[in-house]
Every structure is written in structure tokens, then in C-alpha cells.
Interface confidence: medium
């Protein structure tokens, strides 16, 4: 029988109000709201935490009955969307001690592990795996890529009694190892003998010049000559002008520095490599995995461009579990989102379509009335002229 | 601690331009520019990151536009075809990011009337 420790799928209505407390820890935090955006695969089910001001800290929590992973799994799973096309912010999730006091908790508040999805720019696409180990917060030592699409996401991590983790998005494994090779919590296992230094006589040169080569007498030969085919301009007044020089022009004959053969070093060792030994510092710690109080997820994130939506938590010591409930939320509603992103899409379209059709319509229904016009006041000007022919004869009989 | 300095609003006519800009003392991964109009929510309008890729709010694209001196340390909005609905208090932000850890800073905020 699995263990569920926490599980939110916001199906209650304002119910959440009561199970997630806000901090006070700044008066300006960002709020959340319960919506399942502007397009989803069901308004129901796919309601969530939606970050709704943009430019905002948010720091939401909900506690949970204290529990310890020792000696058994630890899965984290939420799904997250950030249908706002974001730039910049967190979509990550924050694992507390019951210690935390919910109401002042902020950026600074310790945690025992970090997971999930970031974006910052170009720069930063990673999910964080960030482990609290003896105080201090430790990141992997590798690049995990995260979504950064428009469409609901299902992120899990799992830490397992054995000190191995895995990292799955949409069901699927991304990252999976050991946690002391993947996190440096540990000093490594081997040091470089500080007793051991390359020996002097030690040859780490490949080639060597060959001893036998010598330059050969007719090398020298200067980089730049006078212009052989240069002839002083007749008009040249060595008084005025000086004494004449010819242009210097490259010496087809200059060879560059000689530089004797290379040969195979008969005394090369190869690259001395410095040996290893074992550690002092080092003891394996076979509890990294392990902490004695998990009580309180939390969010604490930042965002440029609101609109995020956190949904389908779930804390369980179950992998099966986690991956049917997963398969149940996200992957019941992920074909029926899309399907409706994308009749927004093609609505979006046309629409922009029949908007260009009817101002490329106006624009030469106005063009067209601007060459009536035009056309008009050309013959109007025709007549005035016509008239004014005729006028000219009629004025000068009546002088006369 | 990083300090921002914002400069260049005021009033200007319906069509008219105006360039704020922001100087910032201190390391920035992005700079952004926001606005609040009275009796309204602070609204984004364009950020800038490091990398370079830029994005604007769809109330200001092809109007506004952003752009950054490195060696001033300084992010500039220039403010073309403004419209009445432009009026706000426009704040510039920068954000410093470390691991999953986000300090931002705020400018005091400048000014911009759009009116006839």
C-alpha cells in the first residue's frame, strides 16, 4: 500500500484557501489564483495555482503530516504550464521541514530539496535538483533541460534508500544516477599523492629536433628586396626630392626562419600522470538520501511574466503510484489541451486573416475614391481651363 | 545592493516620442521596464535579458523599444507614437538571479503624460 503523504488537485473549489497559507514575509508578494488558463483538456481537473501579477516574488506553502524517506523511497511529483510563453521564473518546488514558519517563509528559508523547472532568458532552461546536505544547499553537477512550451508539464524526482536518483518529465526518464557522483556533498574518494612529484628526468617531449639537421648555407636570404624592375621617376630632383630609394617588395627567395626536423624522441615516457591515493577526508555516507522531517512544499519563485499554473502535487513513497497518478491527471487531459491550444490557434488566425483581407479592402477602397477623386478634380481643372479659352476672345472684342 | 536611476519622462502629445533610460550600479542578467497607471495593477512592458533576446508587452509592440548600453551599465525604453492610454508611472527593474536564488531591484519610478 503506497504511502501519500501530501496530494493536491485543487477539486474543491476555494477549498485550497484553507490547505495553503500565504507568507507575510514581504507585503508585496505576488498572488495566486485557481484557474485552469485559457486553454486546457479539462476546466475541472486541470484547475491550479495560476501566478496572476507580473514582475512578483510568490511564497505560497502547505504543511503536511511530518514524515522522514529514511530507508524508503521518496517520489515528488507536480505538473506545471506555463501557458504565458515565459521569459524569466521559476516553476520549481520547495521541500520544507515542519520547522518552517509558513507565514514568514522566503527565499532564504532553508529547505531540504529544490526540484523543478527554470527559465531565465536564453541563458537558464534547467530543472533544478538542489539537496540541503548538512546545511548547505548542493546543485547536480549536471544540465537537465526542461520544458519551456506553453503546455502542462509533469515533473517527478526520485530518491531512492540506495543513494540513486531519477528525473522524469511526461513519464519519461531524463536524468538518472548516483547521488554521490551526480552531487559533490562527499570530498572525492581520490586525491593526487601530495608525497608523489614528476621525476626530473621524466621526458614528456613527443618529438625533439633532429641533431643531425643542419641549415643549409643558402637559407638566409632577407624577407624584403628592392624592386628589381623599379626605375626613378625622370622627374626626380634628388635636391627636392632626396636621395631615391626603390620600393621594397617580398623576396621570392625569402624562406623564413629554418627551423631543424622533427623526430621521435627516443627518451619520451609519455604524459607523467600524477597517482592517486586514497582519500583521508573521505567517508561514505550512505544516508545522503535521507532526512528526518519533511513537512511543508512550498512555493517560492519569482516571475517576470505571470500566468504559471502548479497542479497535481503529489509526495509518496511510491514510484508505481506516482507514475499511474501522473498518467491519470496529466496524461488523461494532455491530448484534449493541445487540441484546444491549437483550434485557438487556427481561430487566431483567421481571425488575423479577416482582419488583414477587410484593412487591405478599406485601403484600396480609399485608394480607389483618392484616384476618383484625383480624376475628378483633373477634368474640373480641364473645364476651368476650357472656360477661360473661351472667355479670353469675348473680353477682347468688348475692349475694342 | 544594486541602485537604479531612471530619467527622461514628462509630457508629451498623442503621437509624440519619449526615451527613458535606466543606469544600474552592479552585475544584471535582465532589465525590464513596467508601468502603473492610476487605480491599476504595475503591468510589464518590455525586459531585455544578458543574452540579448528582448520581449514586449503586445500593448507596445512596434511602438516601444528597448535596448541596453553595456559600457553605461543603462537599459533605454524609447517611447514612439504615444497614445493617451501610455500615461503611467514607468518603473525600470533589474533582476539579479543566482541558482534558483532572485534578487530584484526597483527605480523610483518616472513619470509619462500622454495629453493634448
Known amino acids: 500500500e503506497p504511502a501519500v503523504y501530501f496530494k493536491e488537485q485543487f477539486l474543491d473549489g476555494d477549498g485550497w484557501t484553507s490547505r495553503w497559507i500565504e507568507s507575510k514575509h514581504k507585503s508585496d508578494f505576488g498572488k495566486f489564483v485557481l484557474s485552469s488558463g485559457k486553454f486546457y483538456g479539462d476546466e475541472e481537473k486541470d484547475k491550479g495555482l495560476q501566478t496572476s501579477q507580473d514582475a512578483r516574488f510568490y511564497a505560497l506553502s502547505a504543511s503536511f503530516e511530518p514524515f522522514s524517506n529514511k530507508g524508503q523511497t521518496l517520489v515528488v511529483q507536480f505538473t506545471v504550464k506555463h501557458e504565458q510563453n515565459i521569459d524569466c521564473g521559476g516553476g520549481y518546488v520547495k521541500l520544507f521541514p515542519n520547522s518552517l514558519d509558513q507565514t514568514d517563509m522566503h527565499g532564504d528559508s532553508e529547505y531540504n530539496i529544490m526540484f523543478g523547472p527554470d527559465i531565465c532568458g536564453p541563458g537558464t532552461k534547467k530543472v533544478h535538483v538542489i539537496f540541503n546536505y548538512k546545511g548547505k544547499n548542493v546543485l547536480i553537477n549536471k544540465d537537465i533541460r526542461c520544458k519551456d512550451d506553453e503546455f502542462t508539464h509533469l515533473y517527478t524526482l526520485i530518491v531512492r534508500p540506495d543513494n540513486t536518483y531519477e528525473v522524469k518529465i511526461d513519464n519519461s526518464q531524463v536524468e538518472s544516477g548516483s547521488l554521490e557522483d551526480d552531487w559533490d556533498f562527499l570530498p572525492p574518494k581520490k586525491i593526487k599523492d601530495p608525497d608523489a612529484s614528476k621525476p626530473e628526468d621524466w621526458d614528456e617531449r613527443a618529438k625533439i629536433d633532429d641533431p643531425t639537421d643542419s641549415k643549409p648555407e643558402d637559407w638566409d636570404k632577407p624577407e624584403h628586396i628592392p624592386d628589381p624592375d623599379a626605375k626613378k621617376p625622370e622627374d626626380w630632383d634628388e635636391e627636392m626630392d632626396g636621395e631615391w630609394e626603390p620600393p621594397v617588395i617580398q623576396n621570392p627567395e625569402y624562406k623564413g626562419e629554418w627551423k631543424p626536423r622533427q623526430i621521435d624522441n627516443p627518451d619520451y615516457k609519455g604524459t607523467w600522470i600524477h597517482p592517486e591515493i586514497d582519500n583521508p577526508e573521505y567517508s561514505p555516507d550512505p544516508s545522503i538520501y535521507a532526512y528526518d522531517n519533511f513537512g511543508v512544499l512550498g512555493l517560492d519563485l519569482w516571475q517576470v511574466k505571470s500566468g504559471t499554473i502548479f497542479d497535481n502535487f503529489l509526495i509518496t513513497n511510491d514510484e508505481a503510484y506516482a507514475e499511474e497518478f501522473g498518467n491519470e491527471t496529466w496524461g488523461v487531459t494532455k491530448a484534449a489541451e493541445k487540441q484546444m491550444k491549437d483550434k485557438q490557434d487556427e481561430e487566431q488566425r483567421l481571425k488575423e486573416e479577416e482582419e488583414d483581407k477587410k484593412r487591405k479592402e478599406e485601403e484600396e477602397a480609399e485608394d480607389k475614391e483618392d484616384d476618383e477623386d484625383k480624376d475628378e478634380d483633373e477634368e474640373d481643372e480641364e473645364d476651368k481651363e476650357e472656360d477661360e479659352e473661351e472667355d479670353v476672345p469675348g473680353q477682347a472684342k468688348d475692349e475694342l | 545592493q544594486v541602485q537604479l536611476q531612471e530619467s527622461g519622462g514628462g509630457l508629451v502629445q498623442p503621437g509624440g516620442s519619449l526615451r527613458l533610460s535606466c543606469t544600474a550600479s552592479?552585475?544584471?542578467?535582465?532589465f525590464g521596464w513596467y508601468r502603473q497607471a492610476p487605480g491599476k495593477q504595475r503591468e510589464f512592458v518590455a525586459n531585455m535579458y544578458v543574452g540579448g533576446s528582448i520581449r514586449y508587452s503586445d500593448s507596445v509592440k512596434g511602438r516601444f523599444t528597448i535596448s541596453k548600453d553595456n559600457a553605461k551599465n543603462t537599459a533605454y525604453l524609447q517611447m514612439n507614437i504615444l497614445k493617451p492610454e501610455d500615461t503611467a508611472v514607468y518603473y525600470c527593474?533589474?533582476?539579479?538571479?543566482?541558482?534558483?536564488?532572485?534578487?530584484?531591484?526597483w527605480g523610483q519610478g518616472t513619470q509619462v503624460t500622454v495629453s493634448s
Open positions: 527593474n533589474a533582476l539579479v538571479r543566482f541558482e534558483g536564488r532572485n534578487d530584484d531591484y
Open positions: 552592479g552585475s544584471i542578467a535582465a
